[in-house]
Amino acid sequence: MAVTACQGLGFVVSLIGIAGIIAATCMDQWSTQDLYNNPVTAVFNYQGLWRSCVRESSGFTECRGYFTLLGLPAMLQAVRALMIVGIVLGAIGLLVSIFALKCIRIGSMEDSAKANMTLTSGIMFIVSGLCAIAGVSVFANMLVTNFWMSTANMYTGMGGMVQTVQTRYTFGAALFVGWVAGGLTLIGGVMMCIACRGLAPEETNYKAVSYHASGHSVAYKPGGFKASTGFGSNTKNKKIYDGGARTEDEVQSYPSKHDYV
């Protein structure tokens, strides 16, 4: 029961986590313009992995996708890749874990197969969570680095002048969503791995019965072996006769030359 609960909870936690990773990846608020020095600005900018948005104080918002792949920083591309890998691994993990759930019966799937699938999905969730956490952390590091490297330069163009404004960007909501989602996916994966141990079929431990011949005139009663097979009326391995047939639990520790195992 505990195994099923652990597996089920792991699945649900991972599902929430992966939904969060997808949400974070699609969100536009990865970096938001820092308004510390200019709190009354009419327009501010926030940017995601895929597009840039501007928002007015009135609430009017406009977003545009980045034009090119080549003009974007390598770090941004790396973050995109990490998040996509996280989503793909998580989605495959979810698919595998659905079939691995103990509460779902699919044909005559053995427990060993379910255990293997649970472990596989668990590992996938762990890697997925790590990818998301890594992606968000790389992006956060990029923001922090850029924040403290504020420089502005000017150059003259055709007829006029273009000034590069070093706008400081700070952590957006997507970063926190990504960190939490990655953590949940990771926790879900660990729970699935723990559940896998409980699902693995253990060796059946039948109680061995040893017979102690106390003398040469021992009369073995018919049906004595019913104790070991577990099919007779005597399924609890109780002593059937006084001749010395005992369950392994009852065997005395001192050796005897008449012991037969």
């Epitope: 327009v43 900018n45 840039s52 007015e56 009017f60 974007l72 006029g160 000034q163 590069t164 960007y169």
Partner: nanobody
Framework: EVQLVGSGGGLVQPGGSLRLSCAAS????????TGWYRQAPGKQRDLVAT???????NYADSVKGRFTISRDKSKNTAYLQMDNLKPEDTAVYFC??????????????WDAGTQVTVSS
């Protein structure tokens, strides 16, 4: 690169009208605000009017009710309609655009300036 081309300046009599235009070109992702500053001889550059991407406008007190700023979003062009011009409006009018050109790449572009002279 981002380029701004301003036009429409010239000589006009007091009480007359002029229309300045400012066209932005290049790899512009988001055009945040566009507007004009003016600089009279021997004076500092002052804000005339601005318009945001959403159409919110802002005017200097000295031009309120006489000047109107507008924009054509599809052409990335802003217009400054100047009515009831006064001699004190004589200056070089500089068009500017605050733009996002890429990932965490914000720039302010200026044109070379357009001379507006109000004289009888």
């Amino acid at each position: 690169e981002v380029q701004l081309v301003g036009s429409g300046g010239g000589l006009v009599q007091p009480g007359g009208s002029l229309r300045l235009s400012c066209a932005a070109s290049g790899s512009i992702l988001n055009l945040m605000t566009t507007g004009w500053y003016r600089q009279a001889p021997g004076k500092q550059r002052d804000l005339v009017a601005t318009i945001t991407f959403g159409g919110t406008t802002n005017y200097a007190d000295s031009v309120k009710g006489r000047f109107t700023i507008s924009r054509d979003k599809s052409k990335n062009t802003a217009y400054l309609q100047m009515d009831n011009l006064k001699p004190e409006d004589t200056a070089v009018y500089f068009c500017y655009a605050d733009v996002i050109v890429g990932f965490q790449d914000r720039r302010v572009a200026w044109d070379a300036g357009t001379q507006v002279t109000v004289s009888s």
